[in-house]
Interface confidence: medium
């Protein structure tokens, strides 16, 4: 049986059940290389509390559909008196990056995971030429996830004192040059994740090969190398390589740009101080508030919730968007879709789509940006579930009793963007983390 998601095959992936202190290793095409789980384990569970290993999915006992991968075992388990076998179930959803498998829950018999990934899309519009895993767990099993930094088009400019060259990078995947409105990035060779531009020429100085690595819990490293044997004439016989070190800052701060810290014989060392390098629980919440010592800040958007069936309305040219954030109030127009953001076509109000659901909510504060994300909406033709990204700005004089109102700023590939000026986005900072 052919591997269902070939682009995920090259790596062993990790997921964590934080509540029970369990680390899972997953290899969806072969077996994980862990002796204690046996030679054919596709999903190996490491219980750090008891220091034991169990195979909870066998690579030989795999069954697959386009959106579900199941690995059975021959190990019996007792679930309400019936004689089942231990198994792992991975539900796949279309995403814009390779993404990460997320542990959902585990019963006596079944270990459930969910994975939003380009590999599960119906169309190839989000697929990279080359992409590597962009997250890592530290020794305390805390997740550091750089997926939000991945650019689907364009690149980051590296801050460099050399006026004659510009070094552009992407994170964990190659630079998509096709959407560049000018010639600056178009000259970059396909597959490059680090592109050096000199005048009208562009050179590949690194492609992604290995996934993100953790050096210390506040430092992550990504390495790009130029694979082909052909040397560049200005590299003195050396093969180009780029090392990006992502540093979690010691306290809350605005984002910085990637900076070139060393350059010798086409070996480029880049340091990027960004809160995305910090563990995810420092940046994100599933509720509408971020507070406590863990996050160093106090943010509470719950006063923005609307009651009594009313919603915020945002005008988007062909569509009206109805928003009801930070609550579980049904939007009247949205046909019991559990939508936090509802898209209604102006010319045909029967065309209603959920652009993100209220139980699929993430609040993130990173690098000075406060963002509320609703995902899991109705599918687009690519298979990607509509989502909404609301970028908040602090405005102490916002109208509507300080609440302000969301403004639609655009749509890209079924992701809807809004900005929202409100006094409730004014962040209160605490002490160091």
């Amino acid at each position: 049986q052919a591997a269902p998601f070939p682009e995920l095959c090259s790596y062993t992936w990790e997921a964590v059940d934080t509540k029970n202190n369990v680390l899972y290793k997953i290899n969806i095409c072969g077996s994980v290389d862990i002796v204690q789980c046996g030679p054919s384990s596709a999903v190996c569970m490491h219980d750090l509390k008891t220091r034991t290993y169990h195979s909870v999915g066998d690579s030989v006992l795999r069954s697959a559909t386009r959106s579900l991968l199941e690995f059975n075992t021959t190990v019996s388990c007792d679930q309400q008196g019936t004689n089942h076998r231990v198994q792992s179930s991975i539900a796949f959803l279309c995403g814009k990056t390779l993404g990460t498998p997320e542990f959902v829950t585990a019963t006596e018999c079944v270990h459930y995971f969910e994975w939003r990934t380009t590999a599960a899309c119906k169309k190839d519009i989000f697929k990279a030429n080359k992409e590597v895993p962009c997250y890592v767990f530290d020794e305390e099993l805390r997740k550091h996830d750089l997926n939000p930094l991945i650019k689907l088009s364009g690149a980051y400019l590296v801050d460099d004192s050399d006026p004659d060259t510009s070094l552009f990078i992407n994170v964990c995947r190659d630079i998509d040059t096709l959407r560049d409105p000018g010639s600056q990035l178009r000259a970059c060779p396909p597959g490059t994740a680090a592109c050096l531009v000199r005048g009208h020429q562009a050179f590949d100085v690194g492609q992604p090969r290995d996934g993100l690595k953790v050096v210390r819990k506040d430092r992550l490293v990504l390495s790009y190398v130029r694979e082909e044997a052909g040397k560049l004439d200005f590299c003195d016989g050396h093969s180009p390589a780029v090392t990006i070190t992502f540093v979690c800052p010691s306290e809350r701060r605005e984002g910085t740009i990637p900076k070139l810290t060393a350059k010798s014989n086409c070996r480029y060392e880049i340091e990027w101080i960004t809160e995305y390098a910090c563990h995810r629980d420092y940046l994100e919440s599933k509720t509408c508030s971020l507070s406590g010592e863990q996050q160093d800040v106090s943010i509470d958007l719950t006063p923005l919730a609307q009651s009594g069936g009313s919603s915020y309305i945002s005008d988007g040219k062909e569509y009206l968007f109805y928003l009801n954030v930070c609550g579980e109030t049904e939007i009247q127009f949205c046909n019991k879709k559990q939508a936090a953001v509802c898209q209604v076509k102006k010319s045909d109000t029967s065309q209603v789509k959920a652009a993100g659901r209220y139980h699929n909510q993430t609040l993130r504060y990173s690098d000075g940006f406060l963002t509320l994300i609703y995902f899991g909406g109705d599918e687009c033709s690519s298979g990607f579930q509509r989502m909404s990204v609301i970028n908040f700005e602090c405005n102490k004089t916002a109208g509507n009793d300080g609440k302000g109102t969301p403004v639609f700023t655009g749509e890209v590939d079924c992701t809807y963007f809004f900005t929202w000026d409100t006094e409730y986005a004014c962040v209160h900072h605490h002490h160091h983390h």
Partner: nanobody, 123 residues
């Protein structure tokens, strides 16, 4: 590619105000970062202001901070530059530009340009 057309330039007295507009058509308006640049006679093109497409984050050249404001109307695919307290040294051709490179004020990283609109500040 994106096509950009600037308007709103003209002659204004020192201390006066002007509002420049830049209408975009062609490829999706919402994937780019937007900038205003200017070029005075005999000088290099210089950065004035920029706005990120996915949020309201803006940046300004030190020489215009507090006097100029960049903004955007996504429904009209238009960006604006509100210029207050104009000075003779603001006299230049003002250009609107689009880029998909983040964190840049370098004109060479902006791929699409308008034809420019002349602003003259003189008594």
């Amino acid at each position: 590619d994106v096509q950009l057309v600037e308007s709103g330039g003209g002659l204004v007295q020192p201390g006066g105000s002007l509002r420049l507009s830049c209408a975009a058509s062609g490829r999706t308006f919402n994937t780019y970062n937007w900038g205003w640049f200017r070029q005075a006679p005999g000088k290099e093109r210089e950065f004035v202001a920029a706005i990120r497409w996915s949020s309201s984050k803006t940046s300004y050249a030190d020489s215009v901070k507090g006097r100029f404001t960049i903004s955007r109307d996504n429904a009209k695919n238009t960006i604006y530059l509100q210029m207050n307290s104009l000075r003779p040294e603001d006299t230049a051709v003002y250009y609107c530009a689009a880029s998909i490179v983040d964190f840049t004020t370098n004109p060479s990283h902006f791929g699409s340009w308008g034809q420019g609109t002349l602003v003259t500040v003189s008594s």
